[in-house]
């Protein structure tokens, strides 16, 4: 429709246009986590604030039970940052003991769940070895990319160790998505 | 307006549509910083290139005095990367001296200032301990997320230590925002 | 066109509107790399999966021979993550040998090639020293920003060392762009 005038013609059907302001969007922020039991080899999912402070959901993008629900098919930009913190790493203790260095690691995964599909799909992964020498460490992992999602898809953020997630400030750990 | 033809009806008022090309947008790039006095417990703000090289502002998004000025209310994607570099870290010096390991850290904050509100709002924070063993280190912190902003809001990027910011290349340290 | 009704007037030419769904977009994912000869002081380019799994190109955004081809002028958001992994670092070996600490580094560059311009333009760079103490390390570098591109521009992702790139999973290393 580039540069085309809208002439009064009943015959002409235009490509689907829509106001940008009514697109599904969400920005979720960290809350204090309640550690829960999870299956071995399956990372626990974070839960989120969806309406207080900087957090919001709008235009039928809903948050429920750790999931962002996709209300409409299309291409979405999805992002998350998780800030991890710890007080020394096993790696440095192992190093001091002179044993082989198996590094600790921190991992964030943005996962898509489609009810009609048995297995979740990992959309994005950020993973980092942590072999700090100092006794206290903290660092963020940021992820963001575009994906084609279907109405009814659900998105969640999983982490390798929920007890290392910094939940103290809403600007440090967050999760969002918007329809392009 | 999905799939709807534009029939010649004066009665029908459509949702606000707008050309994507006329939305406020900016990509700012690093310049050499002039260290300035700042308040205790308040990180200094970076200033930016806004028209040379890769940098631009358009559609009423203006840059002035370290701030990006938001010309129109709406949901914006805001991002920044700051590359830091340093010579060894206090942490490793402390370690060598056998004293307790207090880590150095590097921090980036994207801050919103609203004239009608007394306190700035921290939108995004990336913070990382730096406890490098090597004598020279460098690393980026990247941030990006979506926020609902109001006309007149101002955005800036604050860093924990302006003297550690790598200002040598426009692709290493940058700041941008665009209306969705 | 905010809040304006589309009255049947042949005189009125509207700003270029276009359906969001027909904008050029691509998300490319990592594949196993074939190390190729590259010029000294020039980082090798990664090649990508463009149609299997999470990868796609659409609306005239094409991928060919390591390049994303820009089919239409405009402002694009461009992003990439590269996950690197290695076995110990030269830095720690140098340290053990008591020689000066020249850190290893890992670097990602998103580069624009314009046929009419002799030199590629570096749009984004993420560079990090790697001076790990543990014997195995892995970490991502993420980049993303908005740029004004011209029809015919080509985008690629270059890395400092192709042999350190983790090509094992499509969610760890990826490259994308979309017209805003």
């Amino acid at each position: 429709l580039k540069g085309q005038e809208f002439a009064p013609s009943h015959q002409q059907v235009y490509a689907p246009l829509r106001a940008d302001g009514d697109k599904p969007r969400a920005h979720l922020t960290v809350v204090r986590q309640t550690p829960t039991q999870h299956f071995k080899n399956q990372f626990p999912a974070l839960h989120w604030e969806h309406e207080l402070g900087l957090a919001f959901t709008k235009n039928r993008m809903n948050y429920t039970n750790k999931f962002l629900l996709i209300p409409e098919s299309g291409d979405y930009f999805i992002y998350s940052q998780v800030t991890f913190r710890g007080m020394t790493s096993e790696c440095s203790e192992i190093r001091q003991a002179g044993r082989p260095n198996k590094p600790d690691s921190i991992t964030v995964v943005i996962t898509k769940v489609t009810d009609s599909y048995p297995e979740p799909t990992q959309l994005l992964m950020g993973t980092k070895s942590v072999c700090e020498v100092g006794s206290n460490w903290f660092q963020p992992i940021y992820l963001g990319a575009m994906f084609s999602l279907q109405e009814g898809d659900k998105l969640m953020v999983n982490v390798s160790d929920i007890s290392l997630v910094d939940y103290t400030k809403e600007d440090k750990t967050f999760f969002g998505a918007f329809l392009l | 307006l999905k799939g709807q033809e534009f029939a010649p009806s004066h009665q029908q008022v459509y949702a606000p549509l707008r050309a994507d090309g006329d939305k406020p947008r900016a990509h700012l790039t690093v310049v050499r910083q002039t260290p300035t006095q700042h308040f205790k417990n308040q990180f200094p703000a970076l200033h930016w290139e806004h028209e040379l090289g890769l940098a631009f502002t358009k559609n009423r998004m203006n840059y002035t005095n370290k701030f990006l000025l938001i010309p129109e209310s709406g949901d914006y994607f805001i991002y920044s990367q700051v590359t830091f570099r340093g010579m060894t870290s206090e942490c490793s010096e402390i370690r060598q001296a056998g004293r307790p390991n207090k880590p150095d850290s590097i921090t980036v904050v994207i801050t919103k200032v609203t004239d009608s509100y007394p306190e700035p709002t921290q939108l995004l924070m990336g913070t990382k301990s730096v406890c490098e063993v090597g004598s020279n280190w460098f690393q980026p912190i990247y941030l990006g997320a979506m926020f609902s902003l109001q006309e007149g809001d101002k955005l800036m990027v604050n860093v924990s230590d302006i003297s550690l910011v790598d200002y040598t290349k426009e692709d290493k340290t940058f700041f941008g925002a665009f209306l969705l | 066109l905010k809040g304006q009704e589309f009255a049947p007037s042949h005189q009125q030419v509207y700003a270029p509107l276009r359906a969001d769904g027909d904008k050029p977009r691509a998300h490319l994912t990592v594949v196993r790399q074939t190390p190729t000869q590259h010029f000294k002081n020039q980082f090798p380019a990664l090649h990508w999966e463009h149609e299997l799994g999470l990868a796609f190109t659409k609306n005239r955004m094409n991928y060919t021979n390591k390049f994303l081809l820009i089919p239409e002028s405009g402002d694009y958001f461009i992003y990439s993550q590269v996950t690197f992994r290695g076995m110990t670092s030269e830095c720690s070996e140098i340290r053990q040998a008591g020689r000066p600490n020249k850190p290893d580094s890992i670097t990602v560059v998103i580069t624009k090639v314009t046929d009419s311009y002799p030199e590629p333009t570096q749009l984004l760079m993420g560079t990090k020293s790697v001076c790990e103490v543990g014997s195995n390390w892995f970490q991502p570098i993420y980049l993303g920003a908005m740029f004004s591109l011209q029809e015919g521009d080509k985008l690629m992702v270059n890395v400092s060392d192709i042999s350190l790139v983790d090509y094992t999973k499509e969610d760890k290393t990826f490259f994308g762009a979309f017209l805003l």
Partner: antibody, heavy 118, light 107 residues
């Protein structure tokens, strides 16, 4: 309801040993970090040790490092503190406490008194 | 180690009073600051975590503020059950350290 019950305190001579236990119920013990905090009579609170949910990380205050050992048995929902080479200054009420991410101590036991005296 | 200095060490106040207790860290601790209440013969109870977040079940008359090195616990209207000792604690780095405590007594 979250419950933490400490046991194993008592009177011990200087140089002696004691093993404190903390029995947890009402929450998923294996997912929480656990801590020992002590309080000498009439004094303030002193953190002495922490253990990660999976025992990957152990932390100690300098005042007890090398003498005390923290451990846990997730199958038994139990936390332990093995105290060796006890000194008079270790006399205190010992509390076990949960934490979620090394931020705060959100649940506490009622404490057990350890008295080191000859 | 990070030293935590609380003031005052004790104070006398009446029911209904607004009470403020301050805590200062020897170095910046961001918002890694918690407040606890302890009554005689009882275990401490978490009131405020991360400088300003109210622990579930704690009355809203308790509030916390501050970041960096200076922090405040405020009781907006003192109630009879609030007479107790109050401790601040930093969780920025190990060793985790507490302030010396503030005893709030009935005037």
């Amino acid at each position: 309801e979250v419950q933490l019950v400490e046991s194993g305190g008592g009177l011990v001579k200087p140089g002696g040993s004691l093993r404190l236990s903390c029995a947890a119920s009402g929450f998923t013990f294996s997912t929480y970090n656990m801590n020992w905090v002590r309080q000498a009579p009439g004094k303030g609170l002193e953190w002495i040790s922490s253990i990660h949910s999976s025992s990957n990380y152990l932390y100690y205050a300098d005042s007890v490092k090398g003498r005390f050992t923290i451990s846990r048995d997730n199958a038994k929902n139990s936390l332990y503190l093995q105290m060796n080479s006890l000194r008079a200054e270790d006399t205190a009420v010992y509390y076990c406490a949960t934490d979620r991410a090394m931020v705060d101590f959100d649940y506490w036991g009622q404490g057990t008194l350890v008295t080191v005296s000859s | 180690d990070i030293q935590m200095t609380q003031s005052p060490s004790s104070l006398s106040a009446s029911v209904g009073d607004r009470v403020t207790i301050t805590c200062r860290a020897s170095q910046s601790i961001s918002t890694y600051l918690n407040w606890y209440q302890q009554k005689p013969g009882k275990a401490p109870k978490l009131l405020i975590y991360a400088a300003s977040s109210l622990q579930s079940g704690v009355p809203s008359r308790f509030s916390g503020s501050g970041s960096g090195t200076d922090f405040t616990l405020t009781i907006s209207s003192l109630q009879p059950e609030d007479f107790a000792a109050y401790y601040c604690q930093q969780s920025y780095s190990t060793p985790l350290t507490f302030g010396g405590g503030t005893r709030v007594e009935i005037k």
